[in-house]
Interface confidence: medium
């Protein structure tokens, strides 16, 4: 779910991110891998660079909460709403919340954190929902094997519309 309407983007290409706390049922190392892989999905097709920080402020702040958690968008227990994120032009850019009451995993059991994080970080970068069922920004959760997951052409077109294409590292 995205919070705050309107097309928007970050006005810089290097973004820091921080994982503030962790769910009950995933090892912190697995959570870190899932979030790293999620931001990499977006940096692979844009000039964006993501840098993880352990302390202090960050552009993108990932956290796990349950029920009402003071942002006006309460979670609803297991199932239903999995997460939400605030768009760059909102009052809270970069805030990404996941429902702590979900069974999060790095596999096909419960909800795959990498897939949901890719969706929510898409919102954090300025993407709204897509009506294309093959898009990671489609509002309903669908499981894909994370090892073979790729953004749809729709996702790539929309994120590159905001940030441009990834510069080639090849020097002729």
């Amino acid at each position: 779910t995205s919070i705050s309407p309107g097309r928007c983007k970050w006005n810089k290409h290097t973004l820091t991110y921080r994982i503030i706390n962790y769910p009950h049922d995933m090892k912190p190392s697995a959570v870190k891998d899932s979030i790293y892989n999620a931001v990499s999905i977006w940096s692979n097709v844009t000039p964006l660079i993501f840098q993880q920080v352990q302390n202090g402020d960050a552009d993108i702040k990932v956290s796990f909460w349950q029920w009402a958690h003071e942002d006006g968008w309460p979670f609803d227990g297991p199932g239903g709403i999995l997460g939400h994120a605030f768009l760059p032009n909102s009052g809270n850019p970069g805030v990404v919340h996941f429902d702590k009451n979900e069974h999060w995993s790095a596999s096909d059991t419960g909800y795959n954190l990498f897939l949901v994080a890719t969706h929510e970080i898409g919102h954090s970068l300025g993407l709204q929902h897509s009506g294309n069922q093959s898009s990671i920004m489609y509002p309903t959760y669908w499981y894909h094997d994370p090892r073979t997951f790729q953004l749809s052409a729709d996702d790539i077109q929309r994120i590159q519309h905001l940030y441009g294409e990834k510069c080639s590292s090849d020097i002729p």
């Epitope: 706390n21 702040k61 003071e70 942002d71 006006g72 605030f86 009052g91 809270n92 805030v95």
Partner: antibody, heavy 119, light 107 residues
Framework: EVQLLESGGGLVQPGGSLRLSCAAS???????AMWWVRQAPGKGLEWVS?????????WYADSVKGRFTISRDNSKNTLYLQMNSLRAEDTAVYYC????????????WGQGTMVTVSS | DIQMTQSPSSLSASVGDRVTITCRAS??????LNWYQQKPGKAPDLLIY???SLQSGVPSRFSGSGSGTDFTLTVSSLQPEDFATYFC?????????FGGGTKVEIT
């Protein structure tokens, strides 16, 4: 700079009324639930009241229910606490506070305003 | 309501000492535990949130740990500006409740 600034405290007789205000600046006030927390002299911190970002829902500690009313004006970036039927035990420093979106903790506090209820 | 019990209520220490304050919740609160520092005549300042996350701008000598019902705030090497009162607070359920405070005084 993110800031909260309370005003309206003072000396009042038991049974009297006061209205506290809290002016917010430096952040998008309308996005945040806001709180009043109080601290009696030499004592700990006690939650008093809470209001949703839209102002549509409010909560009160049992000790003030029916006597205090929290409200907000998002167009003025201001939070209020109307305190009626004041008692000696309401004597405290009253703080307005914001709960951070990514901390779920009181990350911004006002400087506090002293309310003294005495005859 | 969830009761928060802090111990000790006061302690005396010297500059450079390692200081540990504990907080116990009356029921499990996962990692929904925050720590604040308050100096006389001032509002509290957030030190630690989500049990172990250091608030931006807070010195790294402060650290938090724990989960469930038992939590700890540690100051690895006490500095003159650290003499203050420390409060824990749970944000697991409404009403948000605070511990009674721990006053850290100079020996």
């Amino acid at each position: 700079e993110v800031q909260l600034l309370e005003s309206g405290g003072g000396l009042v007789q038991p049974g009297g009324s006061l209205r506290l205000s809290c002016a917010a600046s430096g952040f998008t006030f309308s996005f945040y639930a806001m709180w009043w927390v109080r601290q009696a002299p030499g004592k700990g911190l006690e939650w008093v009241s809470r209001i949703y970002s839209s102002g549509g829902k409010t909560w009160y500690a049992d000790s003030v229910k029916g006597r205090f009313t929290i409200s907000r004006d998002n167009s003025k970036n201001t939070l209020y606490l109307q305190m009626n039927s004041l008692r000696a035990e309401d004597t405290a420093v009253y703080y307005c506070a914001r709960v951070g979106m990514s901390t779920y903790a009181f990350d911004i506090w006002g400087q506090g305003t002293m309310v003294t209820v005495s005859s | 309501d969830i009761q928060m019990t802090q111990s000790p209520s006061s302690l005396s220490a010297s500059v450079g000492d390692r200081v540990t304050i504990t907080c116990r919740a009356s029921q499990s609160i996962s990692d929904y535990l925050n720590w604040y520092q308050q100096k006389p005549g001032k509002a509290p300042d957030l030190l630690i949130y989500a049990a172990s996350s250091l608030q931006s701008g807070v010195p790294s000598r402060f650290s938090g740990s724990g989960s469930g019902t038992d939590f700890t705030l540690t100051v690895s090497s006490l500095q003159p500006e650290d003499f203050a009162t420390y409060f824990c607070q749970q944000s697991y359920s409404i009403p948000l409740t605070f511990g009674g405070g721990t006053k850290v005084e100079i020996t």
